[in-house]
Interface confidence: medium
């Protein structure tokens, strides 16, 4: 039970006090007791419960006409059962007794009031009255946890606006309200109570720029909501009528968790006694609600796809047809960014990452806009953000970034359990240098900090700086699987490719050509590839780099070798000894449920079939996956990217609720 104030009683004159239902009020009967008195008794109105404990050891007893010794070891506490109809209508009488004096009486007039700030602390999507419920001043994780949740109101319900909803002080309509969390203030007081008392709603100054609270006028249009707390207003005096009254507030978060903001916001209601104009306002009671701002959550390839994004560029019609067919098979919406909007920037994967935020009452997709800011710079903010589609960005918006800040370098694993620790929403994966040095690249610290601060998908740093572009999607992917952990990790594998080519040569196919059918591309015989010492050395280095990540992924995702599939792939080292794919990089695939859009490798054709395609199909089809090989050679591959780099996917949010996990 919440702690109320301390009330001192004195025989000289009656004491008047307020007691808030649901709180425990202490009664100081000793400090002003008559000198000669050695014991006391208490009588109270039926609406008041008095508890007397004398310790140690504590003997606890509800009052009757018994007398108690008057010593500091006696604790007297009051609670009230019902709210008062009129001021001071509940009475407590203390009688003091001494050996030689007649009894001395002290009177206490109590006013019982109901004041409670309620939010959805049980995470059911509904606000329930919180009397006799757990303490709402703490926020706890897990299925038995409690605490309310706020969404950053980062969508744009007003299509005429260029800003996010949380960037203004207005409630646009009921759509805008649904992105907010309801908080209700319930009061029950005597009619004249607020002539001498005031309620103040407030937020800590350190949190005022992270939240905005609107007060709703019941029964009126939502446009009548007015802002009462926010970046400019840390406190607000409420106009509350006496009697029984409910007041609704709508709360929106303005910032995501980050290094300087753990994501918790406390809203407090304070009851002030303003009866004595000579004295400062005295705090009679406080009630608080703690909200946690919902984190931004990424979705892995194993989540069902809902929408595919790609760019229309010069001469990529065939590529788009293939992606369209794949999207239709997977029953996905398809959004194409036209040439005039992408300004020849085809790398849809690098520009953004689509995740979501979730509260019990609402789930919202949210696009995380990378700071790479090339031709697609405006696409996330102009075309993706909109009604019920949020937006967030981090990192410097003008320079100071590297290729590792593009979101081809940002992936997330499916859910995993690692040495007994569960990651029910998976773990974020991003590429980094192996060791910080003058020429190494790493993801911008602001991005790393943001990803870590979300808490629910603890990031793993992989090593990708060995690649020319430097993105993790150049050597890994995840695909759904019907068995084991529900997925397989796919890793690019030079070892597997050499093994395949060696087998083909042993079977007499050493003359078969790589890149057959590609105009203006020098074709290479299997036997020449196998005898090319420089290429071997290059791929030996690449294999070591991928093995480094293999070990890291096994350890950090709790994987066994049988959870990993090696996809045959060769690389070559270019400027500064950085690697790029020797032929279209098959692991850089588009995963739409069981439908895979894989870069067509143009491998050696043996018995009428590309041996690389055949090998990949033999590895993936037993998992119920359907492989479609997409020709991206001239439009993507020679520009150092593939199918995954050129597409993006919005996926279904997890059914698992993030607040039920324990980070």
């Amino acid at each position: 039970m919440a702690q109320g104030t301390l009330i001192r009683v004195t025989p000289e004159q009656p004491t008047h006090a307020v007691c808030v239902l649901g709180t425990l009020t202490q009664l100081d009967i000793c400090s002003s007791a008559p000198e000669d008195c050695t014991s006391f008794s208490i009588n109270a109105s039926p609406g008041v419960v008095v508890d007397i404990a004398h310790g140690p050891p504590a003997k606890k007893k509800s009052t009757g006409s018994s007398t108690w010794p008057l010593d500091p070891g006696v604790e007297v506490t009051l609670t009230m059962k019902v709210a008062s109809g009129s001021t001071g209508d509940q009475k407590v009488q203390i009688s003091y007794y001494g050996p030689k004096t007649p009894p001395v009486k002290a009177l206490l007039y109590l006013t019982g009031v109901e004041i409670s700030l309620c939010a959805d602390i049980t995470r059911t999507g509904k606000v329930k009255p919180t009397r006799a419920v757990k303490d709402q001043r703490t926020w706890t994780w897990g299925p038995c946890g409690q605490g309310a949740i706020l969404l950053v109101n980062c969508d744009r319900d007003n299509l005429e606006s260029s800003a996010m909803d949380c960037e203004d002080d207005e409630v646009l309509d009921s759509e805008d309200l649904q992105d907010m969390s309801l908080m209700t203030l319930s009061t029950k007081t005597p009619k004249d109570f607020f002539t001498n008392h005031t309620l103040v709603l407030h937020v800590a100054r350190s949190e005022m720029d992270k939240v905005r609270v609107f007060q709703a006028t019941r029964g009126k249009l939502s446009s009548k909501c007015s802002v009462v707390l926010g970046p400019k207003w840390p406190s607000h005096y409420l106009m509350v009528p006496g009697g029984k009254h409910n007041m609704d507030f709508y709360v929106e978060a303005l910032a995501f968790p980050d290094t300087d903001f753990p994501g918790l916001i406390t809203l407090t209601i304070s009851l002030l006694d303003t009866s004595n104009l000579e004295l400062p306002e005295a705090v009679v009671f406080q009630d608080s609600v703690v909200f946690r701002v919902a984190p931004w959550i990424m979705t892995p390839n194993t989540q069902p796809p809902q929408e595919v994004y790609a760019c229309s560029i010069f001469e990529n019609e065939d590529f788009l047809k293939s992606v369209t067919t794949l999207a239709m098979k997977a029953k996905c919406k398809l959004t194409i960014c036209p040439e005039e909007e992408n300004m020849d920037d085809q790398w849809m994967q690098d520009e953004m990452e689509i995740g979501y935020i979730q509260a019990p009452h609402k789930t919202l997709p949210v696009v995380f806009d990378s700071p790479r800011n090339r031709g697609l710079k405006e696409f996330p903010i102009k075309r993706v953000m909109g009604p019920d589609f949020g937006y967030v960005t981090r990192g410097p918006q003008t320079g100071g970034i590297s290729g590792l800040d593009s979101f081809g370098n940002l992936e997330v694993s499916p859910p995993v359990t690692v040495r007994g620790k569960e990651y029910p929403l998976g773990r974020i994966l991003f590429g980094d240098s192996c060791y910080p040095s003058n020429d190494s690249r790493q993801m911008h610290q602001a991005l790393q900090d943001f990803l870590s601060a979300q808490q629910v998908q603890a990031p793993v740093k992989l090593y990708s700086d060995w690649l020319s572009v430097g993105h993790v999607d150049e050597f890994l992917s995840f695909v759904p699987a019907p068995d084991r952990k529900g997925f397989r990790l796919l890793l690019a594998s030079p070892r597997s490719c050499y093994k395949l080519f060696q087998e083909q040569q042993n079977e007499g196919h050493g003359e078969a050509l790589l890149f057959e059918g590609i105009k203006k591309k020098k074709q290479q015989k299997i036997k020449n590839i196998l005898s090319n010492k420089t290429l071997r050395e290059h791929n030996s280095f690449v294999e070591r780099c991928i093995d480094w990540n293999r070990e890291l992924l096994k350890r950090e995702l709790g994987l066994a070798e049988s959870d990993i599939i090696d996809i045959p792939q060769l690389f070559k080292l270019k400027e500064f000894s950085k690697a790029e794919a020797f032929f279209p990089n098959m692991v850089n695939m588009l995963v739409l449920g069981k439908h895979l859009g894989i870069p067509k490798p143009f491998g050696p054709v043996i018995n009428g079939r590309c041996c690389l395609e055949e090998k990949v199909c033999s590895l993936l089809e037993p998992l119920g996956l359907q492989c479609t090989f997409i020709n991206d050679f001239f439009t993507y591959h020679i520009r150092h990217g593939e199918v995954h780099c050129g597409t993006n996917v919005r996926r279904k949010p997890f059914s698992f609720k993030w607040w039920n996990m324990v980070p």
């Epitope: 293999r550 070990e551 890291l552």
Partner: antibody, heavy 119, light 109 residues
Framework: EVQLVQSGAEVKKPGSSVKVSCLAS????????VSWVRQAPGQGLEWMGG????????KYPQKFQGRVTITADESTSTAYMELSSLRSEDTAVYYC????????????WGQGTLVTVSS | EIVLTQSPATLSLSPGQRATLSCGAS???????LAWFQHKPGLAPRLLIY???IRATGVPDRFSGSGSGTDFTLTISGLEPEDFAVYYC??????????FGGGTKVDIK
């Protein structure tokens, strides 16, 4: 899990050098970083530096720069730590330890090698 | 370089009691890359916790780690006889300046 076996105890004169070896088995040597950590009598643990054999990158903290050399021989899965210009305060147990991360988080440890510097 | 300060230097407790060991950093530890080790005389140190709160393989769940930024804690919920040892924290985010704390000795009361 990686097993690390270190060379035996050494007694050295001040001003001389010592080279301690660390043989790794039970994993791909290339995929680890190898750190060296020492503990002087009654003192805490002190990181002396490390090497990533795969990239032949060695790193040393300021304190040991120029006096310690860490090397690795991939063919024998062995790492070495050589400390020169020995003084009595270098008397310590020297441990090698492997790391699976970009950072030098020491995961599996060797049994330790006691080096005594005494005239 | 990041300096790690462990407190208390010695903790005298009985088996079954809860042990709380602190590790303070002179500046925030990058990405909460902080580990805890147990060290017994004549043996190699043993990794207990890494990345602030993740238990290493085979470490009993009575060991738990928490904290962020500059303040970190190792908690042993109920001391077993084999837990009496010296405990070190290590930060490994400030490469190449990896540092250990001075250690906390947990001994039998």
């Amino acid at each position: 899990e990686v097993q690390l076996v270190q060379s035996g105890a050494e007694v050295k004169k001040p001003g001389s050098s010592v080279k301690v070896s660390c043989l790794a088995s039970g994993g791909t040597f290339n995929n680890y970083a190898v750190s060296w950590v020492r503990q002087a009598p009654g003192q805490g643990l002190e990181w002396m530096g490390g090497i990533i054999p795969m990239f032949d990158i060695a790193k040393y903290p300021q304190k040991f720069q120029g006096r310690v050399t860490i090397t690795a021989d991939e063919s024998t899965s062995t790492a070495y730590m050589e400390l020169s210009s020995l003084r009595s305060e270098d008397t310590a147990v020297y441990y090698c330890a492997t790391s699976y991360f970009r950072q030098w988080l020491t995961w599996d440890w060797g049994q330790g090698t006691l080096v005594t510097v005494s005239s | 370089e990041i300096v790690l300060t462990q407190s208390p230097a010695t903790l005298s407790l009985s088996p079954g009691q809860r042990a709380t060991l602190s590790c303070g950093a002179s500046q925030p530890v990058s990405s909460n890359y902080l580990a805890w080790f147990q060290h017994k005389p004549g043996l190699a140190p043993r990794l207990l916790i890494y990345d602030t709160s993740i238990r290493a393989t085979g470490v009993p769940d009575r060991f738990s780690g928490s904290g962020s930024g500059t303040d970190f804690t190792l908690t042993i919920s109920g001391l077993e006889p084999e837990d009496f040892a010296v405990y070190y924290c290590q930060q490994y985010g400030g490469s190449p300046q990896i540092t250990f704390g001075g250690g906390t000795k947990v001994d039998i009361k």
